[in-house]
């Protein structure tokens, strides 16, 4: 079999909300993946599991099941959303993200994603990791996942 390629494109949108009483930040992060099937037969994307880390702590997880079928020599772009919560021992971040004196509140998050594909009863997992900047002070949307350029570090295969 030929390869199935997974390319993490980047953050498509990040929507933020806050709970001042709980000193908690809620970040809904939508990411974009390109999955390319280099085979001459269809491949099933069984599931996508994703997690987001801040400062080595997992702040959000998501799983998508029975996602799509990718035809021979075809590529599909898939968006997935990870709801994240920055709270408790990281509640000090609430002060930073709502700091009145600055307009830009960048934090670095690690996006981890694993794609499970299946063909002819055979399963394969492909993982990617990418560090991304997110502004935790405002909502951000990107045109056509332009955030491909946001890499802090190159992906670790």
């Amino acid at each position: 079999p030929r390869s199935i390629e997974v390319k993490y494109i980047g953050v498509k949108s990040a929507y933020v909300s806050y709970d001042a009483e709980k000193r908690t930040i809620y970040l809904n992060i939508t990411n974009t993946l390109n999955i390319t099937n280099n085979n001459y037969y269809s491949v099933e994307v069984e599931n996508i599991t994703a997690q987001v880390q801040f400062s080595k702590t997992v702040i959000g997880k998501a799983r998508l099941n029975n996602i799509t079928n990718i035809g021979p020599l075809d590529m599909k772009q898939i968006d997935y959303t990870v709801p994240t919560v920055i709270a408790e021992e990281m509640s000090y971040m609430y002060d930073f993200c709502t700091l009145l004196s600055i307009k830009v509140h960048n934090i670095v998050l690690m996006m981890q994603v694993t794609v499970t594909t299946a063909y002819f009863g055979h399963s394969e997992q492909i993982s990617q990791e990418r560090y991304q900047y997110v502004d935790c002070g405002r909502n951000t949307t990107y045109q056509l996942a332009q955030s491909e350029y946001l890499n802090v570090l190159q992906p670790q295969q």
Epitope: V16, A20, T98, K103, V104, T140, T141
Partner: antibody
Amino acid sequence: EVQLQQSGPVLVKPGPSVKISCMASVFTFNDYYIHWVKQSHGKSLEWIGLVYPYNGGTNYNQNFKGKATLTVDTSSRTAYMELNSLTSEDSAVYYCARSYFSNPIGYWGQGTLVTVSE
Amino acid sequence: DIVMTQSPSSLSVSVGEKVTVSCKSSQSLLNSGNQKNYLAWYQQKPGQPPKLLIYGASTRESGVPDRFTGSGSGTDFTLTISSVQAEDLAVYYCQNDHSYPLTFGAGTKLELK
């Protein structure tokens, strides 16, 4: 519909001070920054500063420090701006506006005309 | 403070015409972290408060017609109205949304020919 209801026009003599108000309705007052913006007649917009109702925190434009004082009364969901040492230069329309934290200013009050004249 | 320079200061247009308004900032409005430009465009009609049209340099506010397009990066930005309608006659302001104090351009007045 979201509303920021500002107090009516005021005519004041040069000298002391004037306090104008901005009452919020339909949205969670504590969840937004309230900004104040000055627009002199036929001129552009000047950002005066903002106040965070939740804790009363403020951020002023240096050009208005000492001129404007921003406060809030959360019980009445009202933001106030006091302008002191009034001169004719302070004659303008003053807008209150809101932003969801550091997001852009998305909604504005109708404006309060302040006229400083003998 | 970031200085915002708009041009032209006024523009005489006919309905259906394409219009471009330029805005230059004295410092970059690019958030080098997330690669987003923090610039907003407002429309102000006589006797009314400003209305947010575009933020993040290119994202249209909800309900804004798609004839309004924002573009540009760093220090050079453009607001384009693809086909001007009578209701578009107003003053347009660009605004630095990158750092305090927030600063506005002097405005571009759109008038009917």
